[in-house]
């Protein structure tokens, strides 16, 4: 799985979404886990209704909420009021027994302001060997990225790269 | 081990800059954050910033913004504070310290030794 | 920003003593706070996070507590390794802000 960056600013609300195949996943309940570490195992934050027909019910655990889009395939968590300790890997998992299958990894970031993130005169263009040509750029408050690369300086787009 | 192994004391001129280094081991760098903190002589410490070396997100103390940039080079494992414009007020020690898992949740585990910045004409 | 008023600024003990050192917060931290030491060559240790969680191989003599918007670290019976610099650390909303410390110096 490649990670996803999700940006957002201390003290207002981000929104996560984990797109899925809603044939493949029809009747599994979905979560939203954290990983506090390289090992061990993800941690429970909060998971959609224990009925999946009532899955498109907010359902919150503090600050976070979830809710599916079972027919669309799209999994949203809310981060309200976000804080620095929010920071972090996350994963958007699909339910089906014991098992858990990873939809999404998410790295989420907080920022303390929005301009933080890079300097306007700091661009970074693509080399030789790197190629943005299908990076395909939806407005949003948070940036998707694949592992190991270096983001574009805006904090206002998410970039999806398939 | 991990370690932290912060660049040497310099001795730089009013006006001038200076760029620091802290460098990682023991550890996968890009895992986890790094925060930058300064202790003026006999005083107290001030968090300057943090950065995410897996993305080169940054956060900064407003006080320190303009005067402080944080960059990583995610090949040597090694994260930089420049400071620009030096005055007096700058002469302190710089510590790096590593965040936690991708965060700062638990603080700020390990620290770097610290480099001494002396501003003089 | 979270103001960290740390006291006392300065305790004078003798080795075995029992000490306690109090952080006030200026706004809620839910915990998010840590304990520093600093020895005189600069070298700094994190003793505590979470309010109260031990860090490992930090003797079992020092502990952190939390009462309300107070946070406090005490070392039951100080021992002469114990004798330096310790600060508050706040770490639940930027900028992240530290005590002013308190210089540990023995009697």
């Known amino acids: 799985h490649n990670t996803t960056v999700f940006q957002g600013v201390a003290g207002q609300s981000l929104q996560v979404s984990c797109p899925y195949d809603s044939m493949k996943h029809w009747g599994r309940r979905k979560a939203w886990c954290r990983q506090l570490g390289e090992k061990g195992p993800c941690q429970r934050v909060v998971s959609t209704h224990n009925l999946w027909l009532l899955s498109f019910l907010r359902r919150w655990n503090g600050s976070t909420a979830i809710t599916d889009d079972t027919l669309g395939g799209t999994l949203t968590i809310t981060l309200r009021n976000l804080q620095p300790h929010d920071a972090g890997l996350y994963q958007c998992q699909s339910l089906h027994g014991s098992e858990a299958d990873t939809l999404r990894k998410v790295l989420v970031e907080v920022l303390a302001d929005p301009l933080d993130h890079r300097d306007a005169g700091d661009l970074w263009f693509p080399g030789e060997s790197e190629s943005f040509e299908d990076a395909h750029v939806e407005h949003s408050i948070s940036r998707s990225l694949l592992e190991g690369e270096i983001p574009f300086p805006p904090t206002s787009h998410h970039h999806h790269h398939h | 081990e991990l370690q932290l192994q912060e660049s040497g004391p310099v001795l730089v001129k009013p006006g001038a800059s200076v760029k620091m280094s802290c460098k990682a081991s023991g550890y996968t760098f890009t895992d986890y954050y790094m925060n930058w903190v300064k202790q003026s002589h006999g005083k107290s410490l001030e968090w300057i910033g943090v950065?995410?070396?897996?993305?080169?997100?940054?956060s900064y103390n407003q006080k320190f913004k303009g005067k402080a940039t944080l960059t990583v080079d995610k090949s040597s494992s090694t994260a930089y504070m420049e400071l620009n414009s030096l005055t007096s007020e700058d002469s302190a020690v710089y510590y790096c310290?590593?965040?936690?898992?991708?965060?700062?949740?638990?603080?700020?585990?390990?620290w770097g030794q610290g480099t001494l910045v002396t501003v003089s004409a | 920003d979270i103001q960290m008023t740390q006291s006392p600024s300065s305790l004078s003990a003798s080795l075995g003593e029992r000490v306690s050192l109090t952080c006030r917060a200026s706004?809620?931290?839910?915990?998010?706070l840590s304990w520093l030491q600093q020895k005189p060559d600069g070298t700094i240790k994190r003793l505590i996070y979470a309010a109260s969680t031990l860090d490992s191989g930090v003797p079992k003599r020092f502990s952190g507590s939390r009462s309300g918007s107070d946070y406090s670290l005490t070392i039951s019976s100080l021992e002469s390794e114990d004798f330096a610099d310790y600060y508050c650390?706040?770490?639940?909303?930027?900028?992240?802000?530290f005590g002013g410390g308190t210089k540990l110096e023995i009697k």
């Open positions: 310290a590593r965040g936690t898992y991708y965060s700062n949740y638990e603080g700020f585990p390990y």
């Open positions: 950065i995410n070396p897996y993305t080169g997100a940054t």
């Open positions: 706004q809620e931290i839910s915990g998010y």
């Open positions: 650390l706040q770490y639940a909303s930027y900028p992240y802000t």
